[in-house]
């Protein structure tokens, strides 16, 4: 049994880091493998992660962490029984994938303005809380070409757009994702999408 693709890990910079790797053949990850991880700190102890299958030869492990600070470094040991398959390290602050925003809501009752709001996925005491920026994706269910991205570079988790920038009488969907420039993170996953029917009063044509 050998590791074909070494573990790569990303952290949500809160409580979970996810590591993925591939073995050289079909593997029952949860029964055959264990990923041991330990914070490099005098008084820390090793924790065991039981991996799950992620495709035939792929494995994924969710490492539970109390919290994360920029200085944290973890040692990782991948074991198959008594055999050490791989040894490495992981610094969560250098591999951050933020949590996805939640509670995306479209408010359509504001005079011909669409107000989209969502929730910051982090509590106020987390470093990323004040460092997230967002991308909002809006698309038409009827027209695949009607697909747009709005970059929200301010901290407030909301976006206002004129309803008239979208077609009237059509159903639209929206979703939002986040990233943090300070840690050069990857984008989060998209939030679940929300659907609304876009209708607004056409302005009278001036002749």
């Amino acid at each position: 049994m050998k590791v074909l693709q070494e573990p790569t890990c990303v952290s949500d910079y809160m409580s979970i880091s996810t590591c993925e790797w591939k073995m050289n053949g079909p593997t029952n990850c949860s029964t055959e493998l264990r990923l041991l991880y330990q914070l490099v700190f005098l008084l820390s102890e090793a924790h065991t992660c039981i991996p799950e299958n992620n495709g035939g030869a792929g494995c994924v492990c969710h490492l539970l962490m109390d919290d994360v600070v920029s200085a944290d470094n973890y040692t990782l040991d991948l074991w198959a029984g008594q055999q050490l398959l791989w040894k490495g390290s992981f610094k969560p602050s250098e591999h951050v994938k933020p949590r996805a925003p939640g509670n995306l809501t479209v408010h359509t009752n504001v005079s011909d303005t669409l107000l989209l709001t969502w929730s910051n996925p982090y509590p106020p005491d987390n470093y990323l809380y004040n460092h997230l920026t967002y991308a909002v994706n809006i698309w038409s269910e009827n027209d695949p070409a009607d697909f747009r991205i709005y970059n929200v570079t301010y901290l407030e988790p909301s976006l206002r757009i004129a309803a008239s920038t979208l077609k009237s009488g059509i159903s639209y969907r929206a979703r939002v994702r986040a990233w943090a420039q300070c840690y050069n993170t990857t984008w989060s996953e998209w939030s679940p999408s929300t659907k609304w029917h876009n209708s607004y009063r056409e302005p009278f044509e001036q002749h």
Partner: antibody, heavy 116, light 110 residues
Framework: EVQLLESGGGLVQPGGSLRLSCAAS????????MAWVRQAPGKGLEWVSA????????YYADSVKGRFTISRDNSKNTLYLQMNSLRAEDTAVYYC?????????WGQGTLVTVSS | QSVLTQPPSASGTPGQRVTISCSGS????????FNWYQQLPGTAPKLLIY???HRPSGVPDRFSGSKSGTSASLAISGLRSEDEADYYC???????????LGGGTKLTVL
């Protein structure tokens, strides 16, 4: 709410023994390393000893090595410090502290006086 | 003799910004993170800053920490009378397998 309550302090003669206890509540005791820190009257803080969450690893300051023993009972949520061969310079308020990278919660302390 | 050196005293007037330094000896390893504790008169110490610059919840943002090599600094802005206390820096010393604390700095608010 995290609470740490030390007990067992008192007056003891040089060469004597004392056992300090620290009752923990408000958090999962078995998941945290713990430590003892002391403060002699009018002096600064001095780290004494620390123990990992399971008790597998233990560390002591040179000044108490061989005389003090730290231990814990996770089933009772209690930290202990057994102090033997006590000296006058061990006179101090002894604080129990929870460890999360630093000493993030402290008890109110118990006074140990070593005097004849 | 502490491995971490702090000035024995510091002072400032209300509203001022004061800084307290904490210096490791030349041979002191610079890999560890610094922590800061506040001890108000007659009370137990309280964690103020951990991992160089992180504030536990409940600690006002007037308190900030920074690290440079083997030294660290605690800054208190908008000084208040209730900040009058002893301040200690500390770090885990892996070569000693233990925790080292500075001698403490007594802060007086004039």
């Amino acid at each position: 709410e995290v609470q740490l309550l030390e007990s067992g302090g008192g007056l003891v003669q040089p060469g004597g023994s004392l056992r300090l206890s620290c009752a923990a509540s408000g958090f999962t005791f078995s998941r945290h390393a713990m430590a003892w820190v002391r403060q002699a009257p009018g002096k600064g803080l001095e780290w004494v000893s620390a123990i990992t969450s399971s008790g597998r690893s233990i560390y002591y300051a040179d000044s108490v090595k061989g005389r003090f023993t730290i231990s814990r009972d996770n089933s009772k949520n209690t930290l202990y410090l057994q102090m033997n061969s006590l000296r006058a310079e061990d006179t101090a308020v002894y604080y129990c502290a929870r460890v999360h990278r630093a000493f993030d919660y402290w008890g109110q302390g118990t006074l140990v006086t070593v005097s004849s | 003799q502490s491995v971490l050196t702090q000035p024995p005293s510091a002072s400032g007037t209300p509203g001022q910004r004061v800084t307290i330094s904490c210096s490791g000896s030349p041979l002191f390893p610079d890999s560890g993170s610094f922590n800061w504790y506040q001890q108000l008169p007659g009370t137990a110490p309280k964690l103020l800053i951990y991992a160089d610059s992180h504030r536990p919840s409940g600690v006002p943002d007037r308190f900030s920490g920074s690290k440079s090599g083997t030294s660290a600094s605690l800054a208190i802005s908008g000084l208040r009378s209730e900040d009058e206390a002893d301040y200690y820096c500390g770090t885990w010393d892996y070569s000693l397998s233990g925790y080292v604390l500075g001698g403490g700095t007594k802060l007086t608010v004039l």
